[in-house]
């Protein structure tokens, strides 16, 4: 058993030693969206370039109809970020008046569905408030972490405003993935 | 052909196994920069600290000159966190007289330059608006994200303003890649 | 050595191979936090679920006492999102007096603990200026880097105001940590 | 708000040390830069140089041959010493904090440094 | 090193009048690092502006700041009583930091 040498037997037992260059792995990155009815009081899902520029797909790791598919099951870091852009924002106007109120916000949030369970598991949110005055503002939400998946799973990037985003640069608005 | 039982023979026909140790990582702090002159066009690079203190570089990722030199090719993570400060944004200003404007910002761009390629490539843009009344402001900007990179590709962080970038603490504003 | 011939020799003389699966990981999510007794010029740590809903700790990685224990030295990928909400904030009074101010703020620190050493090292620092006017506001800071650790350092999350933190959603404040 | 408090002998022999030292208050010295900023009436405002909470420096080329700027062993106050004076050095000297960056936004009270035999 | 040039000398006006102060660099001053500043007599300057035309938290908005390269410029708008002083301005695109001469603002 020599080629086992530098490999500590406690670790073969139960996971195989395998090639980082072959995990599957996914870089996707912001295309203009297409206007689509989406439910009154459901985030819209986004959908992605996921071959041109700087998105790829590699290792078993698909993108089809605004869902990355997970291949093979393991620990995934998972990121996202969404830049977003308007004018004054609502409630601004609505602060000279005095009165305090609910202020406009933007949100985005990574969701797992699995077919299996009827139910979409929200993994990471990120949302701010947005109360500018007088000026047109924009801002990016970065969000990132790591999660157990399953073979079968489905990612996707949803947003509380799809017209808000800034969808010009695929360096500003994208979505990864990578078995680790 | 003992060793190999505990790695699959798919992977190992075109990536070789390798020890996660040796692979190329970086974390660059925060220096203090001397004002310098720059294209009026162009966001300046920042320079960083690469051995002092959090900072390191190890298995033949080098730093020099503003950049990450990439020794080997594969898919890298790549991350910033830029933190800006400023006193009362201009844009406060000219809101009191009740008329939009093109507000002040904030901007940080990953850039990756190629030698055998003429223009850099942005990577990753972070931009926000900023546009605070009556104090001292202070944000970060944080940015992360994979992408394949070649052997001999120089990695930078740009800056829209230089000289509203916090440089006092190397937990604020920092730069790193690792080798997925 | 027929076991070797994926495996460059150079790689192998000073790291072992080792699974990727039986890696140290942690993803640990918000709970309600108790009231505790802190240290007025020290930032309070948070805790956190470790085995419920999304969060987990595995190979070896414990979360104890508010401390995600590190169990092998190495390099390390640290993450947190933390969601702040809050009222208008003190400054926004002050501001229509026409008088400039220091700024609310929001901050969060991931620190480490070693205990050789007798002060805590921060390790990424998020802070933010708060000044808003006329409505509650909520707001995410993510941080993330990589770093070297040894066996037995400890990390924890702190924040300038535990009052502030949304412990809503397991989605929206969070922390982690997986050995590259 | 942030307060600089500054002191230190007033007059000087040529060949003497001037030495200054200023406190902070009010804000986190760790946060900021800070630095020292003379006044004369022949060469007008001139920065000497600067220093942050690690104790890193930046100096002008023209004064860094005679000048350290320092950090007391708990980290504020700072402190300047300038070697060699001569009467070139009158001035007063004035310690300040850089915000955002290479910009003073809050200054000490100044102190008047005469050279004179 | 940047050598700045402030002119006029002096400048005598007259309360609600406007004021134009002058600064020129010896050479381009990288991404308009120029700040001014407001000094009374006995007493430590004040920042005004910087970034050429960012206003210092504080400083009303008769305060102007304008130009870039070379050539800046402070305007106040409508002089008040407690704006005769004098002003200076200053270049950070290039160590080592420089101050120019000063402009003395006087009452006519």
């Known amino acids: 058993l020599k080629g086992q040498e530098f490999a500590p037997s406690h670790q073969q037992v139960y996971a195989p030693l395998r090639a980082d260059g072959d995990k599957p792995r996914a870089h996707l990155t912001v295309v203009r969206q297409t206007p689509t009815q989406h439910f009154k009081n459901q985030f819209p899902a986004l959908h992605w370039e996921h071959e041109l520029g700087l998105a790829f797909t590699k290792n078993r790791m698909n993108y089809t109809n605004k869902f990355l598919l997970i291949p093979e099951s393991g620990d995934y870091f998972i990121y996202s970020q969404v830049t977003f852009r308007g004018m004054t924002s609502e409630c601004s106007e609505i602060r000279r008046a005095g009165r305090p109120n609910k202020p406009d916000s933007i949100t985005v949030v990574i969701t797992k569905v699995t077919d299996s369970y009827p139910e979409p598991t929200q993994l990471l949110m990120g949302t701010k408030s947005v109360c500018e005055v007088g000026s047109n503002w924009f801002q990016p939400i970065y969000l990132g972490a790591m999660f157990s998946l399953q073979e079968g799973d489905k990612l996707m990037v949803n947003v509380s405003d799809i017209s808000l985003v800034d969808y010009t640069k695929e360096d500003k608005t994208f979505f990864g993935a990578f078995l680790l | 052909l003992k060793g190999q039982e505990f790695a699959p023979s798919h992977q190992q026909v075109y990536a070789p196994l390798r020890a996660d140790g040796d692979k190329p990582r970086a974390h660059l702090t925060v220096v203090r920069q001397t004002p310098t002159q720059h294209f009026k066009n162009q966001f300046p690079a920042l320079h960083w600290e690469h051995e002092l203190g959090l900072a390191f570089t190890k298995n033949r990722m080098n730093y020099t000159n503003k950049f990450l030199l990439i020794p080997e090719s594969g898919d890298y993570f790549i991350y910033s966190q830029v933190t800006f400060r400023g006193m009362t944004s201009e844009c406060s200003e000219i809101r009191r007289a009740g008329r939009p404007n093109k507000p002040d910002s904030i901007t940080v761009v990953i850039t990756k330059v190629t030698d055998s390629y003429p223009e850099p490539t942005q990577l990753l843009m972070g931009t926000k608006s900023v546009c605070e009344v009556g104090s001292n402001w202070f944000q970060p900007i944080y940015l992360g994200a994979m992408f394949s990179l070649q052997e001999g590709d120089k990695l930078m962080v740009n800056v829209s303003d230089i000289s509203l970038v916090d440089y006092t603490k190397e937990d604020k504003t920092f730069f790193g890649a690792f080798l997925l | 050595l027929k076991g070797q011939e994926f495996a460059p020799s150079h790689q192998q003389v000073y790291a072992p191979l080792r699974a990727d699966g039986d890696k140290p990981r942690a993803h640990l999510t918000v709970v309600r936090q108790t009231p505790t007794q802190h240290f007025k010029n020290q930032f309070p740590a948070l805790h956190w679920e470790h085995e419920l809903g999304l969060a987990f700790t595995k190979n070896r990685m414990n979360y104890t006492n508010k401390f995600l224990l590190i169990p092998e030295s190495g390099d390390y990928f640290i993450y947190s999102q933390v969601t702040f909400r809050g009222m208008t904030s003190e400054c926004s009074e002050i501001r229509r007096a026409g008088r400039p101010n220091k700024p609310d703020s929001i901050t969060v620190v991931i620190t480490k603990v070693t205990d050789s050493y007798p002060e805590p090292t921060q390790l990424l620092m998020g802070t933010k200026s708060v000044c808003e006017v006329g409505s509650n506001w909520f707001q995410p800071i993510y941080l993330g880097a990589m770093f070297s650790l040894q066996e037995g350092d400890k990390l924890m999350v702190n924040v300038s105001d535990i009052s502030l933190v949304d412990y809503t959603k397991e989605d929206k404040t969070f922390f982690g940590a997986f050995l590259l | 708000q942030v307060q600089l408090h500054q002191w230190g002998a007033g007059l000087l022999k040529p060949s003497e040390t001037l030495s200054l030292t200023c406190a902070v208050s009010?804000?986190?010295?760790?946060?900021?830069?800070w630095a020292w900023i003379r006044q004369s009436p022949g060469k007008g405002l001139e920065w000497i140089g600067d220093i942050n909470h690690r104790g890193r420096t930046n100096y002008n080329p023209s004064l860094k041959s005679r000048v350290t700027i320092s950090l007391d062993t708990s980290g504020n106050p700072f402190s300047l010493k300038l070697t060699s004076v001569t009467a070139a050095d009158t001035a007063v000297y004035y310690c300040?904090?850089?915000?955002?960056?290479?910009?003073?936004?809050?200054w000490g009270q100044g102190i008047l440094v005469t050279v004179s035999s | 090193e940047i050598v700045l040039s402030q002119s006029p000398g002096t400048l005598s006006l007259s309360p609600g009048e406007r004021a134009t102060l002058s600064c020129r660099a010896s050479q381009s001053v990288s991404s308009s690092f120029l700040a001014w500043y407001q000094q009374y007599p006995g007493q430590a300057p004040r920042l005004l502006i910087y970034g050429a035309s960012r206003r210092a938290t504080g400083i009303p908005d008769r305060f102007r700041g304008s130009g870039s390269g070379t050539d800046f410029t402070l305007t106040i708008s409508r002089l008040e009583p407690e704006d005769f002083a004098v002003y200076y301005c200053q270049q950070y695109g290039s160590s080592p930091l420089t101050f120019g001469g000063g402009t003395k603002v006087e009452n006519k």
């Open positions: 009010g804000v986190s010295f760790s946060d900021y830069h």
């Open positions: 300040a904090r850089d915000f955002p960056n290479w910009v003073f936004d809050s």
